[in-house]
Interface confidence: low
């Protein structure tokens, strides 16, 4: 299973937990396969 | 102006201890996730550890050949990351980056540090 | 450990050239890998995440793909700026892990 830090930003992107920047800047968060170190 | 700048780097002798630190500014430090990279003289990067994010719990990481005698933490109200390394080696001598990562849904940001050099030698 | 084999490990070309590099992982990786530029002296630069993303402010003769275990990073006509020391990272399992880099330099 994947588990670092950016596959858990990819299973969790379209929600609004993963960080409060997301909310302050009026992100919509979307899956768009943000994965970098 | 997004700056991540890394010190506290030296000789230090075979077995001896050093804590690096990695103060941040211009971004919200407190969602990010940090990790220590390092530079062998010459050599390629190699990962050293990871921090997560405060929402995150701060869950750490390590990689093998460092477990047991590096530890990675943060101090989110100062902005600051840190790296003890204790029981260090010759293999240690590198030079030290801090490494940042936060993924906001559409795209991410990366930033890195200059770096810090460890030298370990009698 | 996922290993990453870069090649080739030099590649000689001449501002104008289009350079392939490329990344084969010991494991499947899905998109998870990015590359980074590193210039003598200095810290690496995110160039591209995802594969096939690049990041903020990357010129557009750069460009990654691939998925899976073989990934590549294509400079479509280079500049004098881009020689340098290029690496592919993964981020699909830990340890994360880097190749051992590919060398542009001027031929």
């Known amino acids: 299973a994947c588990d670092t830090a950016t596959c858990v930003t990819h299973r969790l992107a379209g929600l609004l937990s993963r960080s409060g920047g997301v909310v302050k800047n009026n992100f919509v968060p979307t899956n768009v396969g943000s994965k970098a170190f | 102006e997004v700056q991540l700048v890394e010190s506290g780097g030296g000789l230090v002798q075979p077995g001896g201890s050093l804590r690096l630190s990695c103060a941040a500014s211009g971004f919200t430090f407190s969602n990010y996730w940090i990790s220590w990279v390092r530079q062998a003289p010459g050599k390629g990067l190699e990962w050293v550890a990871e921090i997560r994010s405060e929402s995150d719990a701060s869950a750490t990481h390590y990689a093998e050949a460092v477990k047991g005698r590096f530890t990675i933490s943060r101090d989110n109200a100062k902005n600051s990351l840190y790296l003890q390394m204790n029981s260090l080696r010759a293999e240690d001598t590198a030079v030290y980056y801090c490494?940042?990562?936060?993924?906001?849904?559409?795209?991410?940001?990366?930033?890195w540090g200059q770096g810090t050099l460890v030298t370990v030698s009698s | 450990e996922i290993v990453l084999t870069q090649s080739p490990a030099t590649l000689s070309l001449s501002p104008g050239e289009r350079a392939t590099l490329s990344c084969k992982a010991s494991k499947r990786v899905t998109t998870y890998v990015s590359w980074y530029q590193q210039k003598p002296g200095q810290a690496p630069r995110l160039l591209i995440y995802g594969a096939s993303n690049r990041y903020l402010g990357i010129p557009a003769r750069f460009s990654g793909s691939g998925s899976g275990t073989d990934f590549t990073l294509t400079i479509s006509s280079l500049e004098p700026e881009d020689f340098a020391v290029y690496y592919c990272s993964q981020s699909y399992n830990y340890p994360y892990t880097f190749g051992q880099g590919t060398k542009l330099e001027i031929k």
């Open positions: 490494a940042s990562y936060f993924d906001y849904g559409l795209a991410i940001q990366n930033y």
